[in-house]
Interface confidence: low
């Protein structure tokens, strides 16, 4: 392969915003490879060496009472300016989530599962998944993945409950989201529906039985009952 | 206090391969990169090119600029270079699987330098081109990078899926591996035999019980038939 | 408004150490930029410049005194102290604290000085 | 530790225009700013001008300042009796700041 080596500059013009553009700072950033070695930094507001490769640099541009100006200048005329042209499709923005819920594994009941909330394609990253049992917070066993940014302005996340499902038992995903006016809830049932269509199959298919039972049995013996005058038919001697 | 929003105009260039990129960042999503051979504004989304333009003539002075520091930065430094640094890969899908459910296999590279990277997506073992994209290298905190890699694919239980990552950091390519997990039923023993056994005796009930009936009435009409002794 | 004020003995003997607070109001040395220092001027001679403590704790020291000055600052007290040892009566001077509103700022605020004077 | 080096003295008469000189080197004056102080008898020093040529508020627009390669000055026009003081520049050099030796500006008659 190509062992040549190599070298790296990067330089970064970072605008860090404290409510809305109420407080800004601004840095200007000089790394060689990784090391950073110089900066401009508004609260600063002269450029300092990071390293002893960046003091020339500090005292060269620090001489330059123009250059300094433009910077000190930076909060207003670099961030706040673009702030506000990005604002409406980036501070702005706002993707809801899709919730959805299954289980990891394919135990059946009383087994020890994990239920998955995955909650995919929102925008901003910040929001919060809970699950509740029977309508009670877990907050024990719950493992989440934290949240995965898709590298295309849309994050993802799973969050994970650890339980031991039992008949009957209602898990809800609940998900509260910037992009939502109240929250999201997605139900899941400790019991699958093919698994619940056997049961009342089996359960109808018994009680239809008994209830067939029941009446020819009523229907036979009340005839019986009712006609003891009459000798019933015997088998021939 | 913790900051709410962070922009970030981020440049590098890169010697001796001469690549330069400049792009901006808003809270770790690539707002645009200029194309430095196209010499154009790259918008990750297209809708932002709707709300707002940038002049790439800009990011290519700024480019000029880079390539002189690192000419001096190179001769101040004695000519150490850059140390490689291997990435991490991950694969995951944009969204839940579900069998022949239009998705997105991403694979992720993280906290690797220097921006260079060989990204192959492999269907059962070939190369696959067709739909494929990629972001341009993302800057990182720790001023290593990231970069994503996007392959649309209709998931099957037949098909099995690698991101091949190659990097000077690493000795031999990297292949992460992604297959369909296809969840196999629940055993639903109880179920079954409530259902069988509730069949079983549904239907035994409902013979015998028809039975009954039937026998009931024809008793019932016989005797009326017969008349008091 | 932005004030400073030293406080010390006004008489030290040789060898001891010279411990000087400077406290202030106005302004506080947690504000990114800020610094506190140390200047003094013996009597009908020049200022020079003694040490210098930063908003983020660095500390800096004139070449020649550096091995002698300890400086330190208490931010929730709004103090900063200037220890020097081994005193000589060549230390006798007045000693003002000054403040920096930014990173190699001018001194734009100062105390008005406190008078130290070394002798057995 | 004077490393900045400035005339021991300056005179002029009410009205006219001095200048002070400050003379200092490449580590220093050429690669940092420089700020000049006024020391009246008996008091503190007080900020006269900053970042080569800025005044702070307060301060009359008869001072100025200027800076060129490793040396800077002061220039003091329409000459008053409050202005016999002590001038004192400033500059930095590497971490250090660094004072010159001072100069005694006489107002004549």
């Known amino acids: 392969g190509d062992t040549r080596p190599r070298f790296l500059e990067q330089v970064k013009h970072e605008c860090h915003f404290f409510n809305g553009t109420e407080r800004v700072r601004f840095l200007d950033r000089y790394f060689y490879h990784q090391e950073e070695y110089v900066r401009f930094d508004s609260d600063v507001g002269e450029y300092r060496a990071v390293t002893e490769l960046g003091r020339p640099d500090a005292e060269y541009w620090n001489s330059q009472k123009d250059l300094l100006e433009q910077k000190r200048a930076a909060v207003d005329t670099y961030c706040r300016h673009n702030y506000g042209v990005g604002e409406s499709f980036t501070v702005q923005r706002r993707v809801y989530p899709e919730v959805t819920v299954y289980p990891a594994k394919t135990q059946p009941l009383q087994h020890h599962n994990l239920l998955v909330c995955s909650v995919n394609g929102f925008y901003p990253g910040s929001i919060e998944v809970r699950w509740f049992r029977n309508g009670q917070e877990e907050k024990t066993g719950v493992v989440s993945t934290g949240l995965i940014q898709n590298g295309d302005w849309t994050f993802q996340t799973l969050v994970m409950l650890e339980t031991v499902p039992r008949s009957g038992e209602v898990y809800t995903c609940q998900v509260e989201h910037p992009s939502l006016t109240s929250p999201l809830t997605v139900e899941w049932r400790a019991r699958s529906e093919s698994a619940q269509s056997k049961m009342l199959s089996g359960v109808g298919g018994f009680v239809l039985g008994l209830l067939f039972l029941g009446a020819g049995l009523f229907i036979y013996f009340r005839n019986q009952k009712g006609h003891s005058g009459l000798q019933p038919t015997g088998f021939l001697s | 206090i913790k900051e709410e929003h962070v922009i970030i105009q981020a440049e590098f260039y890169l010697n001796p391969d001469q690549s330069g990129e400049f792009m901006f960042d808003f809270d770790g999503d690539e707002i645009f990169h200029v194309d430095m051979a196209k010499k154009e504004t790259v918008w990750r989304l297209e809708e932002f090119g709707r709300f707002a333009s940038f002049e790439a003539q800009g990011a290519l002075a700024n480019i000029a600029v880079d390539k002189a520091n690192l000419e001096i930065m190179t001769k101040r430094s004695n000519y150490t270079p850059i140390t490689n640094v291997p990435p991490e890969v991950t694969v995951l899908t944009n969204s839940p699987v579900e069998l022949r459910e239009p998705n997105v296999l991403i694979c992720f590279i993280d906290k690797f330098t220097p921006p260079v990277v060989n990204v192959t997506w492999l269907r059962n073992g070939k190369p696959v081109t067709t739909g494929v994209s990629e972001t341009v290298f993302l800057p990182r905190e720790d001023h290593l990078f990231r970069k994503f890699h996007y392959l649309p694919f209709l998931p099957s239980t037949e098909d099995v899926y690698d991101c091949r990552v190659e990097h000077w950091g690493l000795d031999e390519p990297l292949l992460k591996h992604w297959e369909f997990d296809a969840p196999s039923p629940l055993p639903e023993t109880t179920e079954n035999v409530v259902c069988a056994l509730g069949l079983t005796v549904g239907l035994v009930g409902i013979i015998i019980g028809t039975i009954f009936i039937i026998k009931g009435v024809r008793k019932s009409n016989a005797a009326e038939r017969r008349g008091p002794l | 408004q932005v004030q400073l004020k030293e406080s010390g003995p006004a008489l030290v003997k040789p060898t001891q150490t010279l411990t000087l607070t400077c406290t202030f109001s106005?302004?506080?040395?947690?504000?990114?930029?800020?610094?506190v220092g140390w200047i003094r001027q013996p009597p009908g001679k020049a200022l020079e410049w003694l040490a210098l403590i930063d908003w983020d704790d660095d500390k800096y020291y004139s070449t020649s005194l550096k091995t002698r000055l300890t400086i330190s600052k208490d931010t929730s007290k709004n103090q900063v102290v200037l220890t020097m040892t081994n005193m000589d009566p060549v230390d006798t001077a007045t000693y003002y604290c000054?403040?920096?509103?930014?990173?190699?700022?001018?001194?734009?605020?100062w105390g008005q000085g406190t008078l130290v004077t070394v002798s057995s | 530790d004077i490393v900045l080096t400035q005339p021991p003295s300056v005179s002029g008469a009410p009205g006219q225009r001095v200048t002070i000189s400050c003379s200092g080197s490449e580590s220093n004056i050429g690669s940092n700013y420089v700020s000049w102080y006024q020391q009246l008898p008996g008091t503190a020093p007080k900020l006269l001008i900053y970042?080569?040529?800025q005044r702070p508020s307060g301060v009359p627009d008869r001072f100025s300042g200027s800076k060129s390669g490793t040396s800077a000055s002061l220039a003091i026009t329409g000459l008053q009796s409050e202005d016999e003081a002590d001038y004192y520049c400033?500059?930095?050099?590497?971490?250090?700041?660094?004072f010159g030796g001072g100069t005694k500006l006489t107002v004549l008659g």
């Open positions: 106005g302004f506080s040395l947690s504000t990114s930029g800020v610094g």
């Open positions: 000054a403040r920096s509103p930014r990173y190699r700022g001018a001194f734009d605020y």
């Open positions: 970042d080569n040529n």
């Open positions: 400033q500059s930095y050099d590497y971490d250090h700041y660094v």
